[in-house]
C-alpha cells in the first residue's frame, strides 16, 4: 500500500497528490494508479435553515497548500491518525517488533488479497479517462474459507448537486497512470467540491496488472472566485397591497451549494433592514416577498451565501411604492 | 432530461389503504418543493398540498387535511401521497409537480387513475 | 366550488384571437403572480404562462398573459386546431397559503 497520502489544492480545479512509496513492496514499484470520484454534499446542509437564530453556517475548508515537503498533514490517509502539531515520542523495544509483526502481516495479506480475491487485470493502454478495472473481475468468496475480507466502498458521484447516485464498480471513473514518481496533480476538477482519492502501487506492467490494495484520502478543491454571485437583473413586481415580490437567478454553479441568501433593502432616508431567505423559502418564490412597505423610494442589494462563504452583492435596484390607499383599485368584490 | 415520474393506475375498494408514487429524475430532487393536485372525472384541478423533499416540510390544503398523507424520501427521489382509508369519493386522477417559477408547476408527473368502487 | 372564476367554455375559429378571463381576491391575484396551464385532451397539464405573463422556452408566443388589481387573462391569437383544451389559471393565496386553481375554461375551434 502506498504510504502517507498528502492530498491538497492549490486551485479551484487541481488537487495535488503526494505519497510514499510501500514500506514492503512485492517486487519493483512499477507504477501507481490514480482514481479520484466526486463526493456529494452531505445531505444535511439541504435539510438545515440556516436563516434560523443561532445556526452557524457550516465550516467547509479546502485542502490547502503544503508548508513544506514533510510538515504537518492537512488531509490524513484514512488508515492514519492526526498526530495534531506534536512531536511522536522515541519507539519503545516492543514497539518497533509490532511494526515489524504488522509490516510482514501487510505483505501477507497483500499476497492474499492478489492471489485469492482478485484475478489479475490485463493492462490497459492509455491514461485518463478509461478505468481498467472492470475488467479485473471479483472471485467468488465462496470458495475461500471463512475469512472475512473488506473491500473498499465507492462513493456517490452525484450528477447533479443534490441526490447522489452511487456508481457501480463496473462504472468508468477518471484515473491516471503515474510511472518513476511519488505525485500527481490531477486538473479539470469542479470548483470546491470534495473528492475522494484512491492510491495503488503495482509490481506489473504487463502482461498482467498487480496492484496493491487502495489506499484513500479526501479533498476538496479551492473556490471559484465569483461563483457566488448573482448574475443578471434583480426584478420585482409590486402587487396593490404593498407587497413587493423580489426575484432573481441563483448562482449556475456555485462554490458548493447555496446555503442562503441575503436580502439588503432600504427606503429613502431610513436605515437598511435585511431579510434572510433560506434554500427552502427561495424554492418556493424564486425570490422573496417583502410585505407592508410604506411609500416611498426603495433600494434593494442580494448576496448570496455558500459553502464557502459569501458572494457579492449585487448592484441596488430601485423601486417606488405609492400610497396604497390613494391608489383606485378593484380589490371591493 | 427533467421528468416525474408516478406509479400506475390503482384500483381499490372503499376503506382499502393506498400509497400512490412520483419519482423525479434530471434535476436536484431535494431542492424543489412538488405538490399534489385532484382532478376528478370531468373536473378542475384542486390543489393537495406541497412537501419540501430537503427537509420533509409538508403544508396542506384545508380540504385534505386529515384525508391524505404526503411524505417523501430523498434518498430515492420520490415523493408519496397515500391513504389510510379509501372513499368511493376520491375516484380522480391524481397529479405530482415541480414547483420551480415563483409558485407555479413547471414539470408534471403524467397522473395516476385511482378507482375506488364496491 | 374553485376560488378563482373562469368562463366554463370559449371558442374561435382558426386565425381569430380568443382571451379567457380570471378573476379573484385581494388575497390570491391581488397580491400574487398568476400562472396559466393548458390542458390537452386525456394529457397532463403544462405550464404555458407564469409570474402573469412569461411563456416557459417552446411556448408559441401567440399565448400572451397579463394580471390587473384582481383579475387576470390569457389571449390567445392566430388560433390554431391544436390550442384545442381545456385552460386553468392560478395563483397563490396567502390566506390558504396554497396555490388555487380556476374551475377551467374549455376551448373549442371551430
Known amino acids: 500500500v502506498p504510504l502517507d497520502p498528502i492530498s491538497v489544492s492549490n486551485s479551484s480545479s487541481q488537487i495535488i497528490l503526494k505519497w510514499k512509496p510501500p514500506s514492503d513492496p512485492n517486487g519493483n514499484i512499477t507504477h501507481y494508479l490514480v482514481f479520484w470520484e466526486r463526493q456529494a454534499e452531505d445531505s444535511e446542509l439541504f435539510e438545515l435553515d440556516y436563516c434560523l437564530k443561532g445556526l452557524k453556517l457550516p465550516s467547509r475548508t479546502w485542502s490547502p497548500p503544503f508548508e513544506s515537503e514533510d510538515s504537518q498533514k492537512h488531509n490524513q490517509s484514512e488508515y492514519e491518525d492526526s498526530a495534531g502539531e506534536c512531536c511522536s515520542c522515541p519507539k519503545t523495544d516492543s514497539q518497533i517488533l509490532k511494526e515489524l509483526e504488522e509490516s510482514s502481516f501487510r505483505k501477507t495479506f497483500e499476497d492474499y488479497l492478489h492471489n485469492v480475491v482478485f484475478v489479475p487485470r490485463k493492462t490497459s493502454s492509455g491514461t485518463g479517462a478509461e478505468d481498467p478495472r472492470p475488467s479485473r473481475k471479483r472471485r467468488s468468496l465462496g470458495d475461500v474459507g471463512n475469512v472475512t475480507v473488506a473491500v473498499p466502498t465507492v462513493a456517490a458521484f452525484p450528477n447533479t448537486s443534490s441526490t447522489s447516485v452511487p456508481t457501480s464498480p463496473e462504472e468508468h471513473r477518471p484515473f491516471e497512470k503515474v510511472v518513476n514518481k511519488e505525485s500527481l496533480v490531477i486538473s479539470g476538477l469542479r470548483h470546491f467540491t470534495g473528492y475522494r482519492i484512491e492510491l495503488q502501487a503495482c509490481n506489473q506492467d504487463t502482461p498482467e496488472e498487480r496492484c496493491s490494495v487502495a489506499a484513500y484520502v479526501s479533498a476538496r478543491t479551492m473556490p471559484e472566485a465569483k461563483a457566488d454571485d448573482i448574475v443578471g437583473p434583480v426584478t420585482h413586481e409590486i402587487f396593490e397591497n404593498n407587497v413587493v415580490h423580489l426575484m432573481w437567478q441563483e448562482p449556475k454553479e456555485p462554490n458548493g451549494l447555496i446555503v442562503l441568501y441575503e436580502v439588503s433593502y432600504r427606503r429613502y432616508g431610513d436605515e437598511e433592514l435585511h431579510l434572510c431567505v433560506s434554500r427552502k423559502h427561495f424554492a418556493l418564490e424564486r425570490g422573496c416577498r417583502l410585505r407592508g412597505l410604506s411609500p416611498g423610494n426603495y433600494s434593494v442589494r442580494i448576496r448570496a451565501t455558500s459553502l464557502a462563504g459569501n458572494g457579492s452583492w449585487t448592484e441596488p435596484t430601485y423601486f417606488y411604492v405609492t400610497d396604497y390607499l390613494d391608489v383606485p383599485s378593484n380589490i371591493a368584490k | 432530461q427533467m421528468q416525474l415520474v408516478q406509479s400506475g393506475a390503482e384500483v381499490k375498494k372503499p376503506g382499502e389503504s393506498l400509497k400512490i408514487s412520483c419519482k423525479g429524475s434530471?434535476?436536484?430532487?431535494?431542492?424543489?418543493?412538488i405538490g399534489w393536485v385532484r382532478q376528478m372525472p370531468g373536473k378542475g384541478l384542486e390543489w393537495m398540498g406541497i412537501i419540501y423533499p430537503g427537509d420533509s416540510d409538508t403544508r396542506y390544503s384545508p380540504s385534505f387535511q386529515g384525508q391524505v398523507t404526503i411524505s417523501a424520501d430523498k434518498s430515492i427521489s420520490t415523493a408519496y401521497l397515500q391513504w389510510s382509508s379509501l372513499k368511493v369519493s376520491d375516484t380522480a386522477m391524481y397529479y405530482c409537480g415541480r414547483i420551480s417559477t415563483p409558485y407555479a408547476f413547471d414539470i408534471w408527473g403524467q397522473g395516476t387513475m385511482v378507482t375506488v368502487s364496491s | 366550488s374553485y376560488v378563482l372564476t373562469q368562463p366554463p367554455s370559449a371558442s374561435g375559429t382558426p386565425g381569430q384571437r380568443v382571451t379567457i378571463s380570471c378573476s379573484g381576491s385581494n388575497s390570491n391575484i391581488g397580491s400574487n403572480f398568476v400562472t396559466w396551464y393548458q390542458q390537452l385532451p386525456g394529457a397532463a397539464p403544462k405550464l404555458l404562462i407564469y409570474?402573469?405573463?412569461q411563456r416557459p422556452s417552446g411556448v408559441p408566443d401567440r399565448f400572451s398573459g397579463s394580471r390587473s388589481g384582481t383579475s387576470a387573462s390569457l389571449a390567445i391569437s392566430g388560433l390554431q386546431s391544436e390550442d384545442e383544451a381545456d385552460y386553468f389559471c392560478a395563483a397563490w393565496d396567502d390566506s390558504l397559503n396554497g396555490p388555487v386553481f380556476g374551475g377551467g375554461t374549455q376551448l373549442t375551434v371551430l
Open positions: 434530471g434535476y436536484s430532487f431535494t431542492g424543489y418543493w
Open positions: 409570474t402573469n405573463s
